[in-house]
């Protein structure tokens, strides 16, 4: 079974800068899985943001601006990254990665 680890306990960024979060996958080949990213804003329900599937297809939540989040995966390091562009106060949240094994 796959295992996920998010090595960064927290990330502090200046407004309008870029934040990059990592999710390390072990126990399974990352290119044979789909990785999903979610966020939980304080006091709000958890929300799907974006995913990258085994074939590289990227899907994002409807209504999220196309340039806001970028998802990638690096097979060499078995890592998925979530990039948050133009960081603003609304981006303050806990971000989770999840795995779907094909």
């Amino acid at each position: 079974a796959g295992h996920l680890e998010q090595p960064q306990i927290s990330s502090t960024k200046t407004l309008s800068k870029t934040a990059r979060l990592e999710c390390v996958v072990s126990g399974i080949t990352i290119s044979a899985t789909s990785v999903y990213w979610y966020r939980e804003r304080p006091g709000e329900v958890i929300q799907f943001l974006v995913s990258i599937s085994y074939d590289g297809t990227v899907r994002k939540e409807s209504g999220i601006p196309s340039g806001k989040f970028e998802v990638d995966r690096i097979p060499e390091t078995s890592t998925s990254t979530l990039t948050i562009h133009n960081v603003e106060k609304q981006d303050i949240a806990t971000y989770y990665c999840a795995l779907w094994e094909v």
């Epitope: 599937s53 590289g56 297809t57 990227v58 899907r59 994002k60 939540e61 601006p65 196309s66």
Partner: nanobody, 125 residues
Framework: EVQLVESGGGVVQPGGSLRLSCAAS????????MGWLRQAPGKGREFVAA????????YYADSVKGRFTISRDNSKNTVYLQMNSLRAEDTAVYYC??????????????????WGQGTLVTVSS
Amino acid sequence: EVQLVESGGGVVQPGGSLRLSCAASGSTFSDFAMGWLRQAPGKGREFVAAISWTGGRTYYADSVKGRFTISRDNSKNTVYLQMNSLRAEDTAVYYCAASRDCSGPGCRVHEYDYWGQGTLVTVSS
């Protein structure tokens, strides 16, 4: 509402080249990931190539890798498909499609929000 208009199709000899264009109007072009799909006579619609919202990521069907190149110019609201080393089996109607929320080879037909009318490419000697 987004309007997509393809152009550039035609008849070409095997080994030849064509460049398809797809001009978009009616909405913010960069809000959409773009794809090219094709339908050969008597066959289903199949994925050819796709490009992400920003243009930073491209995808290709195995059958066209190394021969076709997809690109986009967000300032011109246009996506292109450069087709080289064309083969008889590339003969099809080529469709441009736009998706708000999906980019890549796995996007299902219903995940594309808008479609062009199609342009016919015939590869024949």
